[in-house]
Each structure stands twice: as structure tokens, then as C-alpha cells.
């Protein structure tokens, strides 16, 4: 049979009796910041070219005495996973080796920079296909390492890096923390967390998804028919590297954002044990295995949504939490979350001409996150409607009134330190779908948007008795985009997306008591795009054996048939 | 030796290049930064990267880097200019004196200066 | 769960050979180098060297280089030690440990339950 | 060959006691040291990986720190089970040597 973290990666309807493509990912290089590779094994001999950088601190002035093997070690079995021939996840793509770590697996962030550098200038001076740079390590929080990484994420490469190894936010590493980064942690066979001791993987909202990180069997650097099993989120990192190398190969027109969408959308959900994270990090993490996407074809007509949480605002009362999307994603709504309910909303604002996501603490409140809903959208032109508190007892509503323009998310703000000793608005009257509603005492921001052929719905779930979660999900076909709680009373903590489903959170219905103040409404708005539907079919109907299904279908190989000899 | 040849050759140039006295200050209300890692043993004191406002050319970093040796060897501080960024970040990697940060936290064009620091494989 | 089986106690007259195996179970065994060790009596542990599984590619000590030899069985996840020319201070238990590899890190994490070789005349 | 020198060669404490094991490498290993358990007829059973990370399902009172040549494997408070022998290993540089063991006996 093929290796677990193989078989986990490959889309359902492949697993039988299929594996790879064999040239999957051949439009693509990937470039590999790590330690000295060999690169005349097996697995990856005439794939790999070992470039000229070299820039590595010494180890401490005394001469290393393991040898060479052990000095190649990590980035060896890092290429065999990317694009080995018998264990790669993108057996077709070629890579380029660059030297940043030495035989302990240490380096600089200075020579991380450097190298990123020399990446940036051989794509100038050279310019090819898509490019992926695989950073397989993690230092502390460095603004010098992220500022980089997003300059070369903004020149148009995919860079993938390793959540960290030290059970810990990654956001307190890099260049894991970097925004414009697809940042990856560690599950193993069980779709568990990786442990190793006390430490184990990263989690957090800087983590994108998570990929198999344990036990992964690749190119060892004993000799050139070795191989070796090796864990952590270097690991994991160099499959989403290999898994975004394939769709690049089939798409190679894809944006970061929107490979980082289609990563995020054919994840295996809702599938790792939450358990394992600390309890403040649950609602951060992405609940996301990464997998390849069955097939390209029929990806483009859909609306791709991520949820991106804010750091959090801190405890003083005037201090606000600030949610962004990628430069080429759309704002199409904006939650808060307080794990105290003390929380005076949230708003959507412009920002250096750009909407961003704000959430506001209250007094006596620990903090706030603010929850952005960031989606591809060509064509749109979106806009915030607000409305200022209502006089009338009836609440505040807010529509969208311009020809064309849908709804996509509801917001509100309030001054009133509690919402809670004011009486909550009446409900939404039926049959006025393009409105947003909320407490007299808030301002409501509508997000409206106008792009070809989307059409949005509201989707409501309300249940009478006190409740600590009220869901709410779009069905098949549909893409939520906004996410929001009726009414905006005091024991609602918040609301956020998780993939399709709007989650309204409140507190434990022990403090609440059973009163109808207690009574939670979670508002879902679902959109769809006819118009991404529509030029899909066309591009499906003239277009014919670039998609990574008609790859898949073309040679089908075990595993086991290329591996056996080795043994 | 090879290195404090290195060193002293490079001091030279940066004294003689230095034509227009010590200090074009930073523009106004702007004050640069110093960031470092917060985990103490990853820390590489001594090498610091210097990054330069976005649209600063390489010529002005280059003349930035020269200032800042030519300053610091007024004060009998001898630095060395590891690499010149261009490309991705204007800036400047330097082995220098902790004690010349304040002083380099000060010259034009500087956005903010970041301690060097470790990163390990994963 | 993932264990290292040895073989049982030899006894050995001076320079004769003895071959020590090491059955693996509950992992792959191929994707683990399987690292032998010996401990004389009352003495501390010294490494002896290891295989790669995945291939036949051995690392030995350079005290052993000569008289050891290792080998492996993929069809029945078993890893042999053998070593010639015995001589009384070669007394000892001998292990078998696999060795992990986590990021950057190696360390034996699994042992066998060790095998006593008696080398007497 | 790297020489692991392990202090002391043995100890004698009472439960509940802090123990602390030392290891000098003759020369720089890192952080690529290993520490290891063994009880009398048993195999030894690994506590601690590259000098300062406690392995899984090993208990919190059990603590290793050190880079470059100078090591340490710390008992908190020691349990009547914890009367072992302790080895210290380095694996930075072939061939893997270990220390002459640490006996720790009931006072």
C-alpha cells in the first residue's frame, strides 16, 4: 500500500487503487531554504539542482565532526517529500537547493534573508514558471524575515513554511507568522496533532492548515537508496509545498490568494481532535488537513471564502482588534468574539483603500478578536452602508439600496457599555432579506457588493431557549459569507465562520439564566456566482487535459510497484 | 587577517567617501526602531539588519552604510558591512557594536534596525 | 504498539561467531535505522553501529569495523547483528534500538529487551 | 572519539530529594545529547532528547538542560521508582558515545 501521509492526501475517489500523476507539478520550481541536500539520491537525482548559495552560521568554531550525511539529512528527506520519485507528493517538479542551515539545523535569520534575496534576483534575471520556496524552518518573531516574505509574496511567489515545533501560537515565530505566508502544522496518521514529548506542533490562527507531519517516510542521506522516516512541520510544510506545486501545474495562472483558497477549500475539515490545543487556541485553529483537490475543473465556478481571525485586542477599554484579507480578496464581512461577551461590536472601515475588519472592547472586558470573511470575488465592487442607533424601539436596519448590489454581511458597533440592560430589537420582518438588523443602541454596517452574476440569501437559525452555540450552515453549492448573531445582547460572545457554517457563541446558560433574553438567532448570508459557474462550464467545454483529473486518470501508480526494489 | 584587512580597508573608503559632514537627520517625526528576538537564546547580538524606507535606492543604502562606519569610526568603533539588500528590502547587514544602535537608529533613510537571530529546521 | 524483540542468550567459545536478531514490530520497519549497543557486565553502554533497513547501508564503530556485521530481513522486519572472532571481554548484552529522527533531532527511542552473549572457553 | 565524562558515578538520596546527574563532553556536541534510564536486567528507556526536551509519557520532574559540552539531567523530587542507573549519550558525532552511567541508590 502506498505511505499513510500519501494515501491521506489523495482525494478520496483516487485512494482504491490510484496514486500520482507522474509529471504532476512539472510546470513548477520549487525552491528549498534548509541545510546541504544529497543530491544524487535516488529519489530525487536529476530533480534537485543544488544552487551555489551557501550562507550558514559556523557551529561554534569547533570543527563538526557527524558526517555528511547527517548534515544533509533534513533537506534530503524535505526534496524526496516534495518531488521524490517513489515518496514525492509532486513527482514532476523540479527544485533548486539553497543552503541556510547547517549540519545542526541552524541558521539566520540574516541568511534566511539573503537567500530569499538571491530567490527574488534569479527570478528577475531568470523568469520562469510559478514558484514555490519552501521554508522548512522557524526562529522567533522576526519583522525583518516576515517584511521579506511579503515582498516576495507580492512579486508573485508561493512561499510555504513550517508552523514550528514548540506546541506553541506560531504566531510568536517566522517567518510563520508572516500573513502573505501559507503557514502549515503537524497532524499524524490518526489526524491528530504531532507530539514529540512536551513540545509538539504549533497551532493558532497564523496556521493556514495543517498536513501529515509524522512518521513520513522519505529520502534518508545514509546512501542514495536510503530511506528514513522523519515528523515534524518541516515535513508537513513540504507536502503543502508538493500539493501547491500540483496545482500550479494545473492552473498555473493561480494567484496566492487563490491557491491559498483552494488549499483551505479541498482540506479534510473538521477531522483533528481540538482537544489537544490549549482551549484559548481552539477557535483559532483551523480545523483543516491538507489534500489535493480531486480536480481542477469545476473549482473555478465556485466562491471561495477563508475566515481570518485578528490577534487580539488586549484588555484596556478603548483597545480595538483589526482583521485584514489578502490584497486580491474581498471583505465581504466582519464578526467579533469576546471569551467575556464584553464587546462593543465590530465594524467594517476603510484602510489605506481598503476595508478591514475592527472589533471593539468594552470596559471590564478581557479583549476582543475581530473575524474578517475574506473572499475571491473578480469584478466586485463592494461598499459599507451604516446606519446610525434608531430612535424607535423597532432597532436599527440598514439595506442595501444601490441597483445590483447584494448583501454579504451585517455588522454592528455600539457605545453602551451593555447591551444587555436595553431592550433588543424586534426581528427582522420576513420578506426583507437585503437588510441588516440589529440593537436600537448600535450602528448596523451592511457590506454590499456588486460583481457579475452573484446572488446572495439569508439563512437564519434561531433557537428560544439560552444556548452556548446556535449554528447556522449554507447548503451545497453555496458559500457563506456573512456571519452574525440576532439579537446583539449582552451573553453573546460573538460570531465567526468555520468553513460553511456561522457559529453563534454564548455564554454558559448557567449565568444567563432562561429567560427569553436568552433567546440567539444565528444569521447566515450564502452567496453563490452564477457568473463563475457560467465561465467555468465554457472553459470546462474548450479545454480538455490540463486538469489534474485528467492527469490523475492518465497513468494510475502504486506506490509499492516503484518502491519494492529498493528494499 | 584577512578579515581586519577587510575591515580596516572598508573604514578607509567610508571616511573618504564621507563628503557631507555627519548628519542629514531623519525626516521629521519619523523615529526608527529597534526590534529583537524575544527569545533570549536565539539572540545573535553584534550583527544587526539595518532596513531602509521602501523606495530607498541601492546607492542610498550603500551611502547609508558608509555613513554609519564613518560615524562610528569617529567614535572608535569599527564596523563591517556584511551585505547590501536590494531587491527584496533596501537595507544593510552589519557587525557592529551594540552600542551604535542609538547612533544608527538615527541616520536617514532607516526604518528600523532588527538584532540577528537564530532559525532552526523543523 | 511498536516494539524491538531479540533473540535469546548465547553462549560462545572464544573465537567462534555469534548472530544476534532484532524483530520489529507495530511500524514500518524500513523507515527506521536500527542502532546496536552493547553493555558488558557492571559497565556502561557503547555504541556499536547501525543499518539502515531501507537499503543495506551500515555505519559501524570503528573498534568493531572489522568483526561486526549487520543485516536485515524486509520480509520479516528483522535486523541481525553478527560478530566474529569472539573473545571473553565480548561478554556483554547486546541491544538493538531504533533510532527517531524529529526535526533536526535523533535520539533511540525504542530498545529491544537485550540478548546475553557469554563467550567462554 | 568524543568522551562522555559523567559525574557522579553513583549517589545515594532519599525520596523526595533533588538530584542532579552532569555530563562533560570532551568536546562541543550542542544540544545532540541524550538521556537515558536503566534499571537492573532492563533496557534503557529514554527520558530526555537533544539535551533538554522530556520525551513523551516521561514525568515532569525529570529535566535535562546544557549546550556545548556541559550537561545536566535533573531530578526534582525523587520517586522510590526512580532508583535507576542514568546514562547521558551524545549523537553529534559518530561514533555515538555515552557516559559511564550515574547509580542512584536509596540513602
Known amino acids: 500500500s502506498i505511505p499513510w501521509n500519501l494515501e491521506r492526501i489523495t482525494p478520496p475517489r483516487y485512494r482504491a487503487d490510484e496514486y500520482q500523476p507522474p509529471d504532476g507539478g512539472s510546470l513548477v520550481e520549487v525552491y528549498l531554504l534548509d541545510t546541504s541536500i544529497q543530491s544524487d539520491h535516488r529519489e530525487i537525482e536529476g530533480r534537485v539542482m543544488v544552487t551555489d548559495f551557501e550562507n550558514v552560521p559556523e557551529e561554534d568554531g569547533t570543527r563538526f565532526h557527524r558526517q555528511a550525511s547527517k548534515c544533509d539529512s533534513h533537506g534530503t528527506h524535505l526534496a524526496g517529500v516534495v518531488s521524490g520519485r517513489d515518496a514525492g507528493v509532486a513527482k514532476g517538479a523540479s527544485m533548486r537547493s539553497l543552503r541556510v542551515l547547517n549540519c545542526q539545523g541552524k541558521g539566520t535569520v540574516s541568511g534566511t534573508l539573503i537567500g530569499l534575496e538571491f530567490i527574488r534576483k534569479s527570478q528577475l534575471v531568470q523568469p520562469v514558471g510559478p514558484l514555490v520556496v519552501l521554508l522548512p524552518l522557524a526562529g522567533g518573531y522576526s519583522r525583518v524575515l516576515n517584511a521579506a516574505c511579503q515582498r516576495l509574496a507580492r512579486a508573485g511567489v508561493v512561499l510555504v513554511t513550517a508552523a514550528g515545533n514548540f506546541r506553541d501560537d506560531a504566531c510568536l515565530y517566522s517567518p510563520a507568522s508572516a500573513p502573505e505566508v501559507i503557514t502549515v502544522g503537524a497532524t499524524n496518521a490518526q489526524d491528530q496533532p504531532v507530539t514529540l514529548g512536551t513540545l509538539g506542533t504549533n497551532f493558532g490562527r497564523c496556521v493556514d492548515l495543517f498536513a501529515p507531519g509524522e512518521d513520513i517516510i522519505g529520502a534518508s542521506s545514509d546512501c542514495s537508496t536510503c530511506f528514513v522516516s522523519q515528523s515534524g512541520t518541516s515535513q508537513a510544510a513540504a507536502h503543502v509545498a508538493g500539493i501547491a506545486a500540483m496545482m500550479l501545474s494545473a492552473e498555473p495562472e493561480l494567484t496566492l490568494a487563490e491557491l491559498r483558497q483552494r488549499l483551505i477549500h479541498f482540506s479534510a475539515k473538521d477531522v483533528i481532535n481540538e482537544a489537544w490545543f490549549p482551549e484559548d487556541q481552539r477557535v483559532l485553529t483551523p480545523n483543516l488537513v491538507a489534500a489535493l483537490p480531486p480536480s481542477t475543473h469545476g473549482a473555478g465556478w465556485q466562491l471561495f471564502c477563508r475566515t481570518v481571525w485578528s490577534a487580539h485586542s488586549g484588555p484596556t477599554r478603548m483597545a480595538t482588534a483589526v482583521a485584514r484579507c489578502a490584497p486580491d480578496e474581498e471583505l465581504l464581512s466582519c464578526s467579533s468574539f469576546s471569551r467575556s461577551g464584553k464587546r462593543r461590536g465590530e465594524r467594517m472601515e476603510a484602510q489605506g483603500g481598503k476595508l478591514v475588519c475592527r472589533a471593539h472592547n468594552a470596559f471590564g472586558g478581557e479583549g476582543v478578536y475581530a473575524i474578517a470573511r475574506c473572499c475571491l470575488l473578480p469584478q466586485a465592487n463592494c461598499s459599507v452602508h451604516t446606519a446610525p442607533p434608531a430612535e424607535a424601539s423597532m432597532g436599527t436596519r440598514v439595506h442595501c439600496h444601490q441597483q445590483g448590489h447584494v448583501l454579504t454581511g451585517c455588522s454592528s458597533h455600539w457605545e453602551v457599555e451593555d447591551l444587555g440592560t436595553h431592550k433588543p430589537p424586534v426581528l427582522r420582518p420576513r420578506g426583507q432579506p437585503n437588510q441588516c438588523v440589529g440593537h436600537r443602541e448600535a450602528s448596523i454596517h451592511a457590506s454590499c457588493c456588486h460583481a457579475p452574476g452573484l446572488e446572495c440569501k439569508v439563512k437564519e437559525h434561531g433557537i428560544p431557549a439560552p444556548q452556548e452555540q446556535v449554528t447556522v450552515a449554507c447548503e451545497e453549492g453555496w458559500t457563506l459569507t456573512g456571519c452574525s448573531a440576532l439579537p446583539g445582547t449582552s451573553h453573546v460572545l460573538g460570531a465567526y465562520a468555520v468553513d460553511n457554517t456561522c457559529v453563534v457563541r454564548s455564554r454558559d446558560v448557567s449565568t444567563t439564566g432562561s429567560t427569553s433574553e436568552g433567546a440567539v438567532t444565528a444569521v447566515a448570508i450564502c452567496c453563490r456566482s452564477r457568473h463563475l459557474a457560467q465561465a467555468s462550464q465554457e472553459l470546462q467545454g474548450s479545454t480538455s487535459g490540463s486538469g489534474l483529473n485528467d492527469i490523475f486518470e492518465a497513468q494510475k501508480i502504486e506506490w509499492h510497484e516503484h518502491h519494492h526494489h529498493h528494499h | 587577517q584577512e578579515d581586519e584587512d577587510g575591515d580596516y580597508e572598508e573604514l578607509v573608503l567610508a571616511l573618504r567617501s564621507e563628503e557631507d559632514g555627519l548628519a542629514e537627520a531623519p525626516e521629521h517625526g519619523t523615529t526608527a526602531t529597534f526590534h529583537r528576538c524575544a527569545k533570549d537564546p536565539w539572540r545573535l547580538p553584534g550583527t544587526y539588519v539595518v532596513v531602509l524606507k521602501e523606495e530607498t535606492h541601492l546607492s542610498q543604502s550603500e551611502r547609508t552604510a558608509r555613513r554609519l562606519q564613518a560615524q562610528a569610526a569617529r567614535r572608535g568603533y569599527l564596523t563591517k558591512i556584511l551585505h547590501v539588500f536590494h531587491g527584496l528590502l533596501p537595507g544593510f547587514l552589519v557587525k557592529m557594536s551594540g552600542d551604535l544602535l542609538e547612533l544608527a537608529l538615527k541616520l536617514p533613510h532607516v526604518d528600523y534596525i532588527e538584532e540577528d537571530s537564530s532559525v532552526f529546521a523543523q | 504498539q511498536v516494539q524491538l524483540v531479540q533473540s535469546g542468550a548465547e553462549v560462545k567459545k572464544p573465537g567462534a561467531s555469534v548472530k544476534v536478531s532484532c524483530k520489529a514490530s507495530?511500524?514500518?520497519?524500513?523507515?527506521?535505522?536500527i542502532h546496536w549497543v552493547r553493555q558488558a557486565p557492571g559497565q556502561g553502554l557503547e555504541w556499536m553501529g547501525y543499518?539502515?533497513?531501507?537499503?543495506?547501508?551500515?555505519k559501524f564503530n570503528q573498534k568493531f569495523k572489522d568483526r561486526v556485521t549487520m543485516t536485515r530481513d524486509t520480509s520479516i522486519s528483522t535486523a541481525y547483528m553478527e560478530l566474529s572472532r569472539l573473545r571473553s571481554d565480548d561478554t556483554a548484552v547486546y541491544y538493538c534500538?531504533?533510532?527517531?529522527?524529529?526535526?533536526?533531532?535523533?535520539?533511540?527511542?525504542?530498545w529491544g529487551q537485550g540478548t546475553t552473549v557469554t563467550v567462554s572457553s | 572519539d568524543i568522551v562522555m565524562t559523567q559525574s557522579p558515578s553513583s549517589l545515594s538520596a532519599s525520596v523526595g530529594d533533588r538530584v542532579t546527574i552532569t555530563c562533560k563532553a570532551s568536546q562541543n556536541v550542542y544540544t545532540a545529547v541524550a538521556w537515558y534510564q536503566q534499571k537492573p536486567g532492563k533496557s534503557p528507556k529514554l527520558l530526555i532528547y537533544s539535551a533538554s526536551n522530556r520525551y513523551t509519557g516521561v514525568p515532569s520532574r525529570f529535566s535535562g538542560s546544557g549546550s556545548g559540552t556541559d550537561f545536566t539531567l535533573t531530578i526534582s523530587s525523587l520517586q522510590p521508582e526512580d532508583f535507576a542507573t542514568y546514562f547521558c549519550?551524545?549523537?553529534?558525532?559518530?561514533?555515538?558515545?555515552f557516559g559511564g552511567g550515574t547509580k542512584v541508590e536509596i540513602k
Open positions: 549519550q551524545q549523537l553529534s558525532s559518530y561514533p555515538d558515545t
Open positions: 507495530g511500524y514500518t520497519f524500513t523507515g527506521y535505522t
Open positions: 534500538a531504533r533510532e527517531r529522527i524529529y526535526s533536526n533531532y535523533w535520539f533511540f527511542d525504542v
Open positions: 543499518i539502515n533497513p531501507s537499503s543495506t547501508y551500515t
